[in-house]
Every structure is written in structure tokens, then in C-alpha cells.
Amino acid sequence: DTEIKVNPPQDFEIVDPGYLGYLYLQWQPPLSLDHFKECTVEYELKYRNIGSETWKTIITKNLHYKDGFDLNKGIEAKIHTLLPWQCTNGSEVQSSWAETTYWISPQGIPETKVQDMDCVYYNWQYLLCSWKPGIGVLLDTNYNLFYWYEGLDHALQCVDYIKADGQNIGCRFPYLEASDYKDFYICVNGSSENKPIRSSYFTFQLQNIVKPLPPVYLTFTRESSCEIKLKWSIPLGPIPARCFDYEIEIREDDTTLVTATVENETYTLKTTNETRQLCFVVRSKVNIYCSDDGIWSEWSDKQCWEGEDLSKKTLLR
């Protein structure tokens, strides 16, 4: 019996379409596939950023695959051909690996890249990114921000920079249509007549960096002699009520501080008849049902009650 062998795929390469980290891995069928004409050949592809401990593995019947990578580091990938037993009348056969790598040749020393990059998606409406210039760069250094997400034909440059001392230190983004729940890629590169500037690459999803507005219309309602219901309304904007978590801080007679996290726009507080003053503030955050992470809003304006007895009427700020 002659051992059945199959070649690895040909022309395996990683192609950068200019999407700031979203790369194409592509290949051609192996040589001498004529013996397996009735076969559906599959390919096992493994890839990772250089330095990562784990490979990502996929099996596909296609001749291409796309995924996002961190272009601050190199990328390595390997692929081999798989033949299920139905192709070989007996046993699974796999080829040797074809391997390839990709990296962007770095310009400039690492210290020249932007520092403390920070992006916030305010109220799920307005994206703002800010950064500090690299360490030791001269005032003639300027930074440019480019971004891409699936749905854009090509990477776009920021058109509304935030400046300080003539340098770009941030970007106000335009309305970003259909941009959440997908990877958002950013590159900040720079230029200087003095020395080359290192580029920086960032990837995140917009729903995970949302900072909502604080809740509004804080009110008190007496529920019983020893219970007070605190209520508030969701902030104006596109974020639905189901997406909010809230944190409340309640101060009773300037002594007791109660903090609580709740999912609804109400909180029932046990009080004593001796309560003379009650104040509370609320802040909001996008919850786990709508994002993997988020940023707490600022605290709301404080709502206070002072007097002999909490009225049965609603107290509205």
C-alpha cells in the first residue's frame, strides 16, 4: 500500500488592505489535487499575533479568511490541507504546514508614539479620542488619526482635530453609522522634520466605551411610614432603558451613606420617623446585556428633602 499524501496549500500570504489591522489571509489549492477530484478539501488555519501564547484555529473550505490583528506586533500564520477519510478510503490525511508572517516595519523609536490614548463614546452618540504627544518629541511633531470599521470603503482621516499649542491631541469623530458591535480600528501616526515617529494601532468596540449622560428628574415618594421610593428617569439619547445599570448614593441626616447598584429606575429605602434630611444622587452605566464594559456617567444633580416629615406628595427637583 502506498501512503497517501497531500501537499500544503500554495501561495499562502497575509494581505493588508489598509484597514488598520483587519487583514486577509489567502492561499491557493495544493498542487496535485487531481487524485482527489471527488473530494471536498478543507484547510486548517492557525494564526496569532507574535508574542501571543495561543493560536486561533479555524477550518474552512475557502481559499481566504479575514480577521483583526494588532499591528503594533507582528503576525504569524500557518495552514495545512486536510483530507477526511472519505477522500482516502480509510484514514485522515493532513499535509505539512505552509507558514507566513507579516509585520509593519516600525519607524521611529517607541517613545515617539502617542501616549495615554483614551477614547470615549459619549452617550452612544459622539466618539472622542484624546492622547498626549510622545516623549521628547519636538513641537513640530504632528499626529494624524485614521479609522476604519466594517462598512467603510476605506480608512478615513479625522477631520476635526482637538489642538493644543498647534499640535493635534485628539479627534472629534463625525456621526458613525452602524459602527457598534464590530471592531473599530484606529491608527495614530505622526510626522516630524526632526525624526521619524512611531505609529500606534488601537482596536475596540464602541459599545464598550460608552459614557452615558447622568439620570434626570430625581424624585421622592412616600410609600409607607418607613419606606421612601426614590425614582429617576433615563437620560435623553439613544440608549434604551434595558441597557442601564445605576449606582445610587443616599445620605441620611449627613451621616449614613448608603450605596446601591440597581437595574431599574427606582429604589426603595427603609427610613425611620426621625429622618430629618435625605439626599441622593444617581449615575448610570451601560450594563452587561448591551456591552462587555462601560464608563460610569457623572453623578446626577443632588436631590434633597428637608423638613419635619416626608410629604406623601412627590418631591420634584
Epitope: T40, I58, K61, P84, W85, S91, E92
Partner: antibody, heavy 121, light 108 residues
Framework: EVQLLESGGGLVQPGGSLRLSCAAS????????MSWVRQAPGKGLEWVSA????????YYADSVKGRFTISRDNSKNTLYLQMNSLRAEDTAVYYC??????WGAGAFDYWGQGTLVTVSS | DIQMTQSPSTLSASVGDRVTITCRAS??????LAWYQQKPGKAPKLLIY???SLESGVPSRFSGSGSGTEFTLTISSLQPDDFATYYC??????????FGQGTKVEIK
Amino acid sequence: EVQLLESGGGLVQPGGSLRLSCAASGFTFSSYAMSWVRQAPGKGLEWVSAISGSGGSTYYADSVKGRFTISRDNSKNTLYLQMNSLRAEDTAVYYCAKVRYGWGAGAFDYWGQGTLVTVSS
Amino acid sequence: DIQMTQSPSTLSASVGDRVTITCRASQSISSWLAWYQQKPGKAPKLLIYDASSLESGVPSRFSGSGSGTEFTLTISSLQPDDFATYYCQQYDTYPPITFGQGTKVEIK
């Protein structure tokens, strides 16, 4: 006649472990890739894991990676799913399924009757 | 990951009706698609593989078509035994293997 018979389901506390088995008969077990697919109560089908015919290649859904391990014993015609660090969201009927054609997964032409795993305190 | 979206979620029909269920993939999956039927408390049953190939023993009133991103399952004349939930599944690229959310065919 192809038959797949799951066992090993039951009630387990969050953080606990279970090992599911699937006894196969009626086909050359070692030649076919196999998978586990689960269905939470009142929900749709969710693929969990796959293994090639030889057992040399294994694949997992992100939701179970690092917690579940698929394996097979071709001498016993049995497929296994070791489930550790179980969570409430792992509660489901678990089916083993035979792959009609392919290295690790494909169309599933035969399914077991399923075994119920309930994760609750 | 490749997302599979079925429509409609629920379909009310009568015996003898021609029924069509649609499955859309978030990217091209060539013809690597299967259709399953599932009845309450039972395991799924393979009806169609490779988008249009009828599994052995499945009645010829079931047929599948489509390629790329758009696929359909057609039941030419609905029978009493056909009231069930139907799922599509892609196996072009994995992990993960992904299923549609299901279409329940109920009696009108």
C-alpha cells in the same frame, strides 16, 4: 442501524463537573468526526465542540473553551464531553451528533436522543 | 463568526400549503448549508445538506436551494407530520458551527 446514546447528564451545582458519554453503534466510529450540540430550554441549537475521527483535532465554541474537553475512545466507540466549572447558562439538553462528511464538522446526519444537564444551586 | 438569520421566526400554514423558509448568512458560505427539522422533545433530523441535497429517507416534498448568502427550504405540500421547528446550519468555516435561530411552522 446507526445509534447514538448519550448518558451522564444530571443536576450539578455551579462550579461543578460532569462527564457526558455517547455510545455509538452501526457505523465505523473511528472514520467519522463527531460533535456535541446543546439546546437550552425553549431555545435554539448551539454547537459546543467537535473532534476529528482520529481524535487528533478538537474544536470548541468560545462559550466553553477552557472549561469543556471533548475526547473519544475509538476502541470503545464512545465520545466524551468533560464539563468543568459549570455555570447556570450551561443548562441544556446535550446531543452528540455524527458528521456526515468532513474533517471536524459538517452536516450532522445522526443525533442521539439527548441528555439533560441542569446547573443550579 | 458567521451569523445565520432565519425568517420568519414563526409561520402559520395549513395542510397542503407550499411553505418557504429563508436563511441568510452574514458572509458567503458557498453551498455549505444544512436544514434540520425538530419536533418537541426530540432530536433534530437532517433534511438537506450541501444546500440542496436531499438526505436519504426524507420525503421529496422537501427541497433546498440557494448559494452564497441566501438559502431557502421549501415544503411543496405541507403535511400534518411537518409541523415542527426548522433550523439552518452553516459548516463552511468553523469554529464555530452556527445555526439559525429556528422557524416554527404551526397550524393556521
